[in-house]
């Protein structure tokens, strides 16, 4: 459109063109113009450029007029916005950039019969590009001077000179695009094209064989695989192979067949050859194996004294036979070694699709939730369960259940309820459905039926199994008493289910580890070692440290069997008069070797780290975000490329922090609405949107922009007795006990009695971290053997 | 005032291929911002976008009927063309051409010419 | 493909009354989309485009809202014109569009 604005009119005599007056007689005295003043408006005609102006012709641009804006002499430069000194020529074709503009300034004379009289006219010439920006221009002769400016403007979404370019922008499967200065259209990120409406594809998707209808998508094409589909699949059901183009089978070292799944070196994966024989590949999956003198078999399983290795598994009794041996399984197990538990599953007997699960020497019928008894044949009373939450009574039914819902209740468990929410909560809460009510989960800080004011937070007894609350600022922390841990004292972790220990061993559970008490003939953590008591053969005591006993598995007939008084990190070294010394391992000192060198003791451990003694080592467990042997390294946050849409990436500690491009908005720039979603806040954190960023409100136990920082409020004062490094794991903590010490606070000393290492029915005295043998009359030695 | 105008035979036999041409006046099919769709209407049932072409010649289709279907344009002629191959009686509807608008919507359509495939 | 779903299929309104009609998506297209009016015979005619403005020529008592996958056409004032099938269509991916609404004198 076509814009001009008259500023300002100075007509001083009140005099029109012709030389009269506007209104009235000339003073006799100073040939002024008496009486009242013009009545001035203007009247503007565009037209087609003419070098050489013409008055009449018609004004082929538009023409238009104001209505009377002021009298003799008037400033308008100071009134903006004042639309009666205005006029505005829409156009509807390509503006042509050069014009002919008609000015003309005109006394309305208010009544029907005497017409109009011109003040002064304007004429101009020129050239005019669409702009925001006015162009002014004066009448400087003739009776009256007048200023007015002028511009035009394009319409909106029309560029160019011409305002005959079109953009608009759009974010819609026709394009993807927003306008320059200029009206070119410049590509949202992801798309590309003219019309910007092709999706640019995962940066490495294949060309050849993905392509996407989505930006950063890559799809496959038939036959290819992979985040960049550059992957053949291979042939359905090849084993050891790989492929160059879709469907082959191209076999691995040692492989053959069309599927790759003959093995051209059985020796070498599978090792078949027991008890120290040479195997030899004879073809594809087959081999031989040529056994030591006093083994044979295809596996040189078959030992000649084949009941000395034990061979009967699961308490079976051997009896050698000429061919070997022959196990007499007990009750429940089969098979040559009695390794096989019998499948008492086969028939099933559990009925109404109960599962069956093989036990040994019997069976256990896993039944659905309608069904109970030994065969799952009994109909379960499902309402004992109570599964009615909200209910008057719950009806059981076969192999099902009904409950008679309260008023306001629905759904089978009647667990559905009216929403009754409805924006009562204040201060950002928000609201939880009722029974024919509300209520409001305020956010930290806040209160009351309406979240109107502040909160105590131990006011609700969060802390389970006797925690004692402490209330803080906009938190709380639960101390918890011991054997349980956890933000609210809620973990109770039992070790000993299932049960690890073997050979009828008993479980001990303890804060962070199980402990198997072995039956007299076992030993190891789990007590699945056989041990050896010297019981069949007499034993002859050699120094304080040594015991011979006869044997037929050595040349000369007798085996040494040294003392464990050392334990096991050191070596017993025999001293005159019956004593003894303790030679000890690397990382190991006292009497019996019995304690661990702290190697901590230097601190080596950076950035927070807690240093964990090792035998001999350290290990350091870094705090969020750091990394390395010594936590040395600040994690790169940004390695996985995280800000999305073009945002820059900036690595912080156990974090990153992306600098949005676009108006794109988020943790990480993936969001045209929000800055939150729900991985914005780690660890529980609630996300508030703040416009041009996020905060994160954190539980407690956590902190940093994303709550992303474990406080180690937590390990201060240390809580751990007896030297137990503590370890921050989030609100709580976790102690790393040193050798002979326990519990969830490394409290209680270890039972180094336990299982029994004095022999002979010696008695056992319990010490920090070591133990002493008592021995029974007859016997000596650090272990009374 | 632009204006659309669809030609092409109203009875094609089934296995064969349906071919319609869109007359452009009043307006130039070269004027970009501008998709020339074809879109069509079952009996007394809704109606079915079937695909669109830009003067530059790239098109898209909708993804149920790509196999089948083919739009090309002749800007010397002002005119654009669909072609569905492999019909069947499913086929039989009102073919309509239309304008997707420079700001959104498709503001001009041709009056519609019925096709029926039958033998 | 996003799947457009009109209520009702049928509006009995008597001329002079107010009628709304609803569109739903499965999915979100944000405000693009667009409603049109078709009378037997006659090809569709473009109302409105990005959910809510007003094509060229069509009278004010026609009026959309709505975004995401909730939307509405109100028309405030029926004349003996507007009895006609109505369609709502998404164009944020390939374009489809409702099964229609037909609005019937009552």
């Known amino acids: 459109q076509f814009e001009l604005e008259i500023l300002s009119m100075q007509n001083v005599n009140g005099e029109l063109q012709n030389g009269n007056c506007c209104g009235g007689a000339r003073n006799p005295g100073d040939r002024k113009c008496t009486r009242d003043e013009c009545d001035t408006y203007f009247k503007v005609c565009l037209k087609e450029y003419q070098s050489r102006v013409t008055a009449g012709g018609p004004c082929s641009f538009g023409s238009g007029s104001t209505p009377v804006i002021g009298g003799n002499t008037f400033n308008l430069k100071a009134s903006r916005g004042n639309d009666r000194n205005r006029i505005v020529l829409p156009f509807s074709f390509a503006w042509p950039r050069s014009y002919t503009l008609l000015v003309e300034a005109w006394d309305s004379s208010n009544d029907t019969v005497q017409p109009d009289s011109i003040i002064e006219k304007a004429s101009h010439s020129g050239m005019i590009n669409p702009s925001r920006q006015w162009q002014t221009l004066k009448q400087n002769t003739g009776v009256a001077h007048f200023e007015y400016q002028i511009r035009v403007t394009c319409d909106d979404y029309y560029y160019g000179f011409g305002c005959n370019k079109f953009c608009r922008p759009r974010d819609d499967f026709f394009g993807h695009y927003a306008c320059d200065q200029n009206g070119n259209k410049t590509c949202m990120e992801g798309w590309m094209g003219p019309e910007c409406n092709r999706a640019i594809c995962r940066q490495g998707c294949s060309p050849k064989h993905g392509s996407c209808k989505l930006p950063g998508d890559c799809r496959c094409q038939y036959g290819w695989q992979g985040l960049y589909c550059d992957k053949c699949i291979p042939h359905p059901g090849c084993v050891h192979g790989i492929c160059n183009e879709p469907w082959q089978c191209l076999c691995e070292t040692n492989w053959g067949g069309q599927l790759c799944d003959k093995d051209l070196n059985y020796c070498g994966t599978h090792q078949p050859c027991l008890n120290g024989g040479t195997c030899s590949n004879t073809g594809p999956d087959k081999y031989q194996c040529s056994c030591p003198e006093g083994y044979s078999g295809p596996n040189c399983e078959i030992a000649e004294h084949a009941c000395l290795s034990d061979p009967c598994h699961n308490r079976g009794s051997c009896k050698e036979t000429s061919l070997g041996f022959e196990c007499e399984c007990s009750p429940g197990w089969t098979g040559p070694t009695c390794s096989t538990n019998i499948d008492d599953c086969s028939p099933n007997n559990c009925s109404h699709g109960g599962t069956c699960q093989d036990l040994v020497n019997g069976f256990k019928c896993v039944c659905p939730p309608q069904w109970t008894g030994k065969t799952c044949q009994l109909d379960a009373n499902e309402c004992e369960a109570k599964p009615c939450v909200n209910a008057k009574s719950c009806k059981n039914l076969i192999a099902s259940y009904y409950c008679d819902c309260l008023p306001g209740w629905m759904g089978q468990n009647c667990d559905i309820n009216i929403n009754d929410c409805l924006g009562q909560c204040q201060n950002d809460a928000s609201c939880r459905d009722l029974v024919n009510g509300y209520r409001c989960i305020c956010p930290p800080g806040y209160a009351g039926d309406h979240c109107e004011r502040d909160i105590d937070e131990c006011a609700s007894n969060p802390c389970l199994n006797g925690g004692h609350c402490q209330n803080e600022i906009n938190r709380f922390q639960c101390l918890c008493p011991t054997g349980f841990s956890g933000n609210l004292c809620q973990l109770d972790i039992d070790y000993c289910e299932p049960n690890p220990c073997q050979n009828g061993a008993q479980c001990y559970n303890r804060a962070s580890d199980y402990f198997c008490k072995c039956p007299e003939d076992y030993e190891g953590k789990n007590c699945s070692h056989l041990k050896d008591h010297c019981r069949t053969t007499p034993c002859e005591v050699i120094d304080s440290c040594t015991v011979a006993m006869a044997s037929n598995d050595t040349p000369e007939g007798v085996r040494y069997i040294s003392s464990n008084v050392c334990g096991p990190h050191g070596k017993c070294k025999s001293q005159s008069g019956g004593k003894f010394t303790c030679d000890c391992n690397k990382g190991f000192t006292g009497t019996y070797c019995h304690e661990n060198i702290n190697d901590c003791e230097s601190n080596p451990c950076r950035n927070g780290g807690t240093c964990i003694d090792g035998v001999n080592s350290y290990k350091c467990i870094c705090s969020d975000g750091w990394e390395g042997a010594y936590c040395e390294t600040n994690i790169n946050d940004c390695s996985q490329n995280p800000c999305h849409n073009g945002g820059t990436c900036r690595d912080l500690v156990n974090d990153f922090y992306c600098d949005c491009k676009n108006g794109w908005k988020g943790k990480t720039c993936h969001s045209r609405d929000s800055q939150c979603d729900e991985a914005t806040c780690n660890n529980g954190g609630t996300c508030y949107d703040e416009g041009d960023a996020f905060k994160c409100m954190c539980p407690g136990g956590w902190e940093g922009t994303t709550c992303n920082i474990a406080r180690n409020s937590s390990c201060l004062p240390n809580p751990c007795h007896n030297g137990g490094t503590c370890v921050v794991n989030g609100e709580s903590f976790t102690c790393v006990c040193k050798e002979g010490w326990e519990g969830p606070i490394c409290a209680q000393n270890t039972n180094d009695c336990s299982p029994h290492p004095c022999y002979n029915s010696g008695t056992c005295v319990d010490g920090d971290n070591w133990y002493r043998c008592e021995c029974a009359p007859g016997f000596a030695g650090p272990d009374c053997r | 005032q632009v204006q659309l105008q669809e030609s092409g035979p109203g009875l094609v036999k089934p296995s064969q291929t349906l071919s319609l041409t869109c007359t452009v006046s009043g307006g130039s099919i070269s004027s970009g911002g501008y998709f020339w769709s074809w879109i069509r209407q079952h009996p007394g049932k809704g109606l079915e976008w079937i695909g669109y072409?830009?003067?530059?010649?790239?098109?898209y289709y909708n993804p149920s009927l790509k196999s089948r279907v083919t739009i090309s344009v002749d800007t010397s002629k002002n005119q654009f063309s669909l072609k569905l191959s492999s019909v069947t009686a499913a086929d039989t509807a009102v073919y309509y051409c239309?304008?997707?608008?420079?700001?959104?919507?498709?503001?001009?359509w041709g009056q519609g010419t019925l096709v029926t495939v039958s033998s | 493909e996003i799947v457009m779903t009109q209520s009702p299929a049928t509006l009995s309104v008597s001329p002079g009354d107010r009628a709304t009609l609803s569109c739903r998506a499965s999915q979100s297209v944000r405000s693009n989309l667009a409603w049109y009016q078709q009378k037997p015979g006659q090809a569709p005619r473009l109302l409105i485009y990005g959910a809510s403005t007003r094509a060229t020529g069509i009278p004010a008592r026609f009026s959309g809202s709505g975004s995401g996958t909730e939307f509405t056409l109100t028309i405030s004032s029926l004349q003996s014109e507007d009895f006609a099938v109505y369609y709502c269509?998404?164009?944020?991916?390939?374009?489809?569009f409702g099964g229609g609404t037909k609005v019937e004198i009552k």
């Open positions: 269509q998404q164009y944020t991916d390939w374009p489809t």
């Open positions: 239309a304008r997707w608008g420079a700001a959104a919507g498709f503001d001009y």
């Open positions: 072409i830009y003067y530059s010649g790239s098109t």
